[in-house]
Structures are given as C-alpha cells and as structure tokens.
Interface confidence: low
C-alpha cells in the first residue's frame, strides 16, 4: 500500500478505495462494484449499446469512446452551435445541411440538385436523362429521334437542349388558333402567292407549291440569260416581238412597213389583251398576203426566205400569246379566212382533238406539254390560205428513198415536179420548240381549198381531187433552206387517205404543212430512144 493507505494493485481504469479495495472509474465496470483481487478488470461501458442510457436526440449518432461517449450530428447534418460533439439531447442543435448550396456542382451539366433531409439527389431537367456511366450527369433527350413522334405530321420536330419544338416547316404556317412550337402545333401550307409573302420579280407570276412557291416567267417573257425559270429568284425579260425584222439583205418597202407595224403591235401588246394582239397580228399578215406590193417582184429564193421567217415568227408569237389566254379552246377566223385554233389546258396524257374548217389534229396531250414548262400546255393551228405570192415556184425536195420509190414505180428517172397546193398552209405548234421528233405521231386532216392556190396562178376547184397518172397527193411541210430560202419536203409525213375534200396525214414532227398535188415529170425512155 502507498503512503495514502491505497492498494497498489488496483487494475487499469480503476481507483483505490482503501488498502484492500479498488473501484472502476466512471465509464468502466467490473463484475462487482468493489474490486478486492488484482485479477479483476475494469471494462469500458458502451453507453451507446441498446438499451441505451444515453439519448442524443434527432439527426444525431452516439459514438462510444474509451470510458465515455460522444453525440455527433449524423452525416448530412451539422450542429448550429458549431461544437462537433455533445452529450445529451438537450445540447443537440443538429440541422440539415443544404449540400446543394454548399456545392452547386454536385449535380453536373443540366442536372438539378434537390436537397433532402440528410442528403441530396440529382434530378435531370425536363428533356434530359442520366448518362449510363454516371447517374449525376444528365444528357439531352432527343425527343425527335426517340421514337415518341411527339409532333404532328404537318410539323418539323426540332430538338433543342432540354426540350423540343414542333415548328411549322418552311413555307407552312400554324392553322388558325394553333401555336407554333408546342407539341400541339398543327400547320398548313402557306399560299405565299395570295398572301403576298412571296418575293417574285414583277416579270414573273407566283405559283404556290406545297411548303413553298416558285416564280415563272409571265406569258410572253423568258428567263434572263443564265437564270432558270420556275425558281424563287427567276427574273424574266420580254420576248414577245423580239425577232420581227426583215431577213438580212432583203430590200422591200412593203415588208419593212409590215415589220414596223408588227413592232408597233409589240409595244401595244403590253397594254392590249392577248386576244386583241392575236387579231391584229393576223390582220397585218392578211394585208401583206393580199397586197404584197414589191415583195411580188423579189426572186423566188428571197420570197421563200421571207415565207420561212414569217411562218417561224408567227408560230413563236402565237405560242407566246397563247400562254396569256385563259385555259380552254380559242378560235379566231379573220375576214380573209386565216384561222387560228388554240387549245390551252393542264398537262395530261389524254388524246385531244382540235381544229376547225381548215385543219384538224389529234394528239396525245403529253406531247403538247413537253418537259420544261410546268404550266398549262398549248397546242395551236394557224391556217393561212393566201400564201400564193410568197410560195410561188417553191420546189419539192424528194429525199433519196422517195426518189427511188418513184423511179421504181415509173420505171424511169424523175426530171422534175410540178406542184399544186390544195390546202391552206397550216402552222402547227405546241408549248415547246422541241418538235423535230415527237414521242408519238400527230394525226392531221387538212381541208382542200374551194379553189386551190397553185402557187402560179388560179386553178379549178380542188374539193375532191383524184390524182391522175403520174400524180400524187402529198402531205408536205415547209422546210428552211440556206440556198433556196425554203422548200417543200415530205420526210416523216405520210398520207393516210383522202375523202370528202380533206386529206389525212400522220407526221412525227411539226412545221407548216400543206396538201400538195405533185405532177411528176417522168423521162419517157421510148421518146428518148426516138430522139436519139
């Protein structure tokens, strides 16, 4: 025992009571309250074990220590006091920590941190989802490609970060009462033409299309060089009377006056209707045919060149003017019996028959439409009866196959051909110029003139002409010719029959046609022998 009369053998975590006894320190316990032998031990009391004598209070945990215990705030909570430990419920100031405020980047891009009692969770913003690798990182949900089809079929789904929009497609607008953007958007085609939202040049006409529009050249106008037709930026120029000038080297006062008058008409056509312009052009042509003046004195090749140009120009101008007319048939017969028949209608592939007293034709409407021009298609017949002066002394070009056939029939060579024109000269034209070889042939029926125009004076009536010996009824067309100005030809045309004062032909190309009676001058081999 020591000087204080205490036992020296007291076990660890105990204190002596006297020389023969010890007691465990607070927080420790032994088998008996008073320790009397050195073999006894003082063991730590776990104040936190249940049933616990200690109550730390809410949001806290009990931590046992050697000989004691601590109350600490649970993870996610902190004491307001600032003291890390406390001993009982009355000292408890634990309160929730807002981790979201403490660390705003706990939840990564496009995630929202939500504080919970003692913790936090990450939630993706609407329109986002967690990436598989990390449940704290949100990525955009592409509603447009996720198979949800959230938008009406009239709209375009537009994914944006965290959301999507149902926007009207370009050239569409929300139907009345519909928004433009939310998922209940419903759209309809904007008619930019009638609503004035188009930007077509004044030289064009606006055509509405689904979701857009196009600008087409006004009738009688053509796209400026290098600019395609039927685009939003199409710009056109007037082409109505662009080529009405006498052929080079032709000197004729009558012809010059005629062309001047046509040019005047061209200027007036900006203010006149197409119908009036058509009638005025035909009137000028009739006047020229009836009073050819000094044209009559010109050499045949020059007259034939004038005929070639006149027929070509008339075809061009009638085609252009026809495009300004309303859809449907159009007919005009001048006092001199020059006839114009037009058919203007939408594209299609039905067979169409058209014409009047001088000429009729049957064609598949797809042939008339062609490929380039998307507007209504045009087919026309211009029948000019009085072309004697211009076509007098015109020759017929016999192509080699025809020549061979004739020489086989007559068993002799052909020395020449005399021609008698039995019908009006009928210029046939379509919406397009691509008529050198048609996809399907066109049938024509050309009426014979009451008194046929033999190109060299008057002949007896030709209503029902039967070919005599060495004569043949031909379906001929006028062909440009650099040497002779122009001539008659028959390639690609065949006569199908003739009755009731009319001859029916079938041709695989277009031009100006006429029914001719050809009288072949055949070399008489017997006579040749005698004269030898």
């Amino acid at each position: 025992q020591d000087s204080r009369g205490c036992a020296r053998w007291c076990p660890q975590n105990s204190s002596c009571v006297n020389a023969t006894a010890c007691r465990c320190n607070p927080g420790f316990s032994s088998f008996s309250e008073i320790i009397t032998t050195p073999t006894e031990t003082c063991d730590d009391i776990n104040e936190c074990a249940t049933p616990s004598k200690v109550s730390c209070g809410k949001f806290s945990d009990c931590w046992n220590t050697e000989g004691s215990y601590d109350c600490v705030c649970s993870p996610g909570y902190e004491p307001v006091s600032g003291a890390k430990t406390f001993k009982n419920e009355s000292e408890n100031t634990c309160q929730d920590v807002d981790e979201c405020q403490q660390n705003p980047r706990l939840c990564k891009s496009y995630g929202t941190c939500v504080n919970t009692l003692g913790s936090y969770t990450c939630q993706c913003l609407p329109g986002f989802k967690f990436i598989p690798e990390d449940p704290k990182v949100c990525t955009d949900v592409n509603e447009c490609t996720s198979g949800q089809n959230p938008c009406h079929s009239s709209t375009h789904c537009l994914n944006n970060v965290g959301s999507y929009q149902c926007r009207c497609r370009p050239g569409w607008q929300p139907i009345p009462g519909s928004p433009n953007g939310p998922n209940n958007t419903v759209c309809e085609d904007v008619d930019e033409c009638s609503s004035g939202q188009h930007q077509c040049d004044s030289s064009t006409v606006c055509f509405n299309t689904v979701g857009s529009y196009s600008c087409r050249c006004r009738p009688g106008w053509k796209p400026r060089h290098g600019i395609p037709n039927n685009q939003k930026d199409t710009v056109c120029e007037d082409m109505t009377f662009s080529t009405w000038t006498p052929p080079p080297g032709v000197h004729s006062q009558t012809l010059s006056r005629f062309f001047d008058k046509v040019q005047d008409l061209g200027r007036d056509s900006k203010t006149s209707s197409a119908e009036v312009t058509i009638q005025n052009v035909i009137k000028l042509v009739d006047e020229l045919m009836e009073a050819p003046g000094d044209v009559e004195a010109l050499a045949p090749p020059v007259r034939h060149l004038i005929a070639t140009q006149l027929l070509s120009n008339l075809e061009d101008i009638m085609r252009i003017l026809a495009k300004s007319l309303p859809k449907g048939p159009f007919t005009y017969i001048s006092p001199s019996n020059t006839e114009l028949t037009l058919m203007i209608q939408e594209r299609g592939d039905k067979n169409v028959t058209m014409g009047q007293s001088s000429a009729r034709m049957k064609l598949n409407w797809a042939v008339a439409a062609g490929a380039e021009d998307p507007g209504p298609a045009v087919a026309g017949i211009l029948s000019i009866q009085n072309m004697t002066t211009l076509l007098a002394n015109a020759s017929l070009n016999l192509h080699s196959k025809k020549q061979a056939e004739l020489e086989e029939i007559y068993e002799s060579s052909i020395r020449g051909v005399q021609l008698r024109r039995l019908s009006a000269v009928n210029s046939i034209f379509l919406s397009h110029n691509n008529t050198k070889e048609l996809n399907s042939p066109i049938l024509f029926a050309f009426s014979h003139l009451e008194s046929s125009d033999g190109e060299a004076g008057r002949d007896p009536p030709a209503k029902d002409v039967m070919p005599g010996p060495r004569q043949e009824l031909l379906c001929a067309f006028w062909k440009s010719d650099s040497d002779r100005g122009g001539h008659w030809a028959t390639e690609g045309c065949q006569v199908l029959g003739s009755k009731n004062g009319s001859t029916t032909c079938q041709c695989s190309h277009l031009s100006s046609f006429a029914i001719l009676m050809a009288h072949y001058d055949v070399e008489d081999w017997k006579l040749t022998l005698i004269t030898r």
């Epitope: 990564k108 891009s109 690798e133 990390d134 955009d140 592409n142 994914n159 944006n160 970060v161 926007r167």
Partner: antibody, heavy 120, light 107 residues
C-alpha cells in the same frame, strides 16, 4: 446557311464597358443556346458562359461573374456579351458559338470573333 | 474546375507523317471530350466528339481515342492543310474548359 455575325473589332478605354453583338441567321434563334468563349495568346480558350435565348436563362463561369453579362434579343436574333470595368487583361478575341447539344455536345457554328482592345 | 492539360505547345511534323496530340484531364470526364482545329485568323472547327467519333465531312485521317483522363487526337498522313492549332475541350462538368492548344508546324 447558318451564320453567326460578329463585329470585327472594338477599341475601348480602361474602366469603360463594351457590349458586343452576335447576330444569328439561317436557323431558329430560340432553339439553340449561345455560348461565349474568350481567346488570348496567354490563356488560350476560356469559356465565359452561355445564354438560352428562349427564356434568358444564363450560366456563367465563376471566373467571369461580375465581369460578363449575357443577354439576348429574340426580335433581332442577336445575342450580346457585355464586359464591364475593362482592363488590359480583357483584351482578347471573343467568340460566340452555337451549342448543338443533342447527341453531340459541341459548338457547331462559331462567329468570326470580335477583337477587343483595351487601351487609353 | 477540371484542368485540361496539353503538354506540348508545339509539334513539328512533315507532310505524310503520323502525329499524336495528347490531352490530360485533371479528373475523370468519361468520354465527354471534343477536339477542335483552329487555323490562323479563323474560328475553331470541331473534328471529333465523344472522344472518338468523327464529324461528317472530317477526313478519316483524323482519329480520336481515350476515356477517363487521357485523350489523344491522331493525324495519320499529315497534309499541309492540317497545319493548325488543335484544342481539346471537356464538357463533363461546368465550367467547360479547354486545353491550352497544340500547334502543328512543319519541320
């Protein structure tokens, strides 16, 4: 085509502010966020922040808070970056860029950049 | 902030060579990395997204690889038009951060 147009250059005095524009065209302005990036020879490319033109929500790099303010005008399809209390440290090229998002998460269209020179 | 380190400021190469530009993130960024190419006087142009996916129109001589913290942009058969500065950028967490750039120059 999709474009972001920025003025070429701004010359400003120290202590002053500058507000640069980024005009969007060729797409729906409100459908994509516009981000701003600073480029200097010393610091390279630094992300300043972003704006959602549809609702005006912004997100800033902590480093540029108080220095940069992002706004957008839907009527003119234009985003703006305003820099205040300018110092020579703010001399840089400032790019606006469209953030594509979706499956890609990148800047798909950039403006040509505005060169800001802070000098007295 | 996540720091994107491009340790090489400059890299010398020759036309036809193969060159690899590296980028290291200061913490795990998954595959949330984009590579940009910037030519003098121009704005950056994206080449690679999600660390290894090439944007359409980008020549297939550009390839990206890596995940976590280490990323590489490889240019095989270098062409003269490839001479530019290349930046990596992470988008894993805000603020978005870029590498300092690696300038590719001719030897």
């Amino acid at each position: 085509q999709v474009q972001l147009q920025q003025p070429g250059a701004e010359l400003v005095k120290p202590g002053a502010s500058v507000k640069m524009s980024c005009k969007a065209s060729g797409y729906t302005f409100t459908s994509y966020n516009i981000h701003w990036v600073k480029q200097t020879p010393g610091q390279g490319l630094e992300w300043i922040g972003a704006i959602s033109p549809g609702n005006g929500d912004t997100s800033y790099n902590r480093k540029f808070k108080g220095k940069a303010t992002l706004t957008a005008d839907i009527s003119s399809s234009t985003a703006y970056l305003q820099l205040s209390s300018l110092t020579s440290e703010d001399s840089a090229v400032y790019f606006c860029a469209r953030f594509y998002g979706g499956s890609y998460w990148y800047f798909d269209v950039w403006g040509a950049g505005t060169t800001v020179t802070v000098s007295s | 902030d996540i720091v994107m380190t491009q340790s090489q400021k400059f890299m010398s190469t020759s036309v036809g060579d193969r060159v690899s530009v590296t980028c290291k993130a200061s913490q795990n960024v998954g595959i949330n990395v984009v590579w940009y190419q910037q030519k003098p006087g121009q704005s950056p142009k994206a080449l690679i997204y999600s660390a290894s996916y090439r944007f359409s129109g980008v020549p297939d001589r550009f390839t990206g690889s890596g995940s976590g913290t280490d990323f590489t942009l490889t240019i095989s058969n270098v062409q003269s038009e490839d001479l530019a500065e290349f930046f990596c950028q992470q988008y894993n967490s805000s603020p978005l951060t870029f590498g300092a750039g690696t300038k590719l120059e001719l030897k």
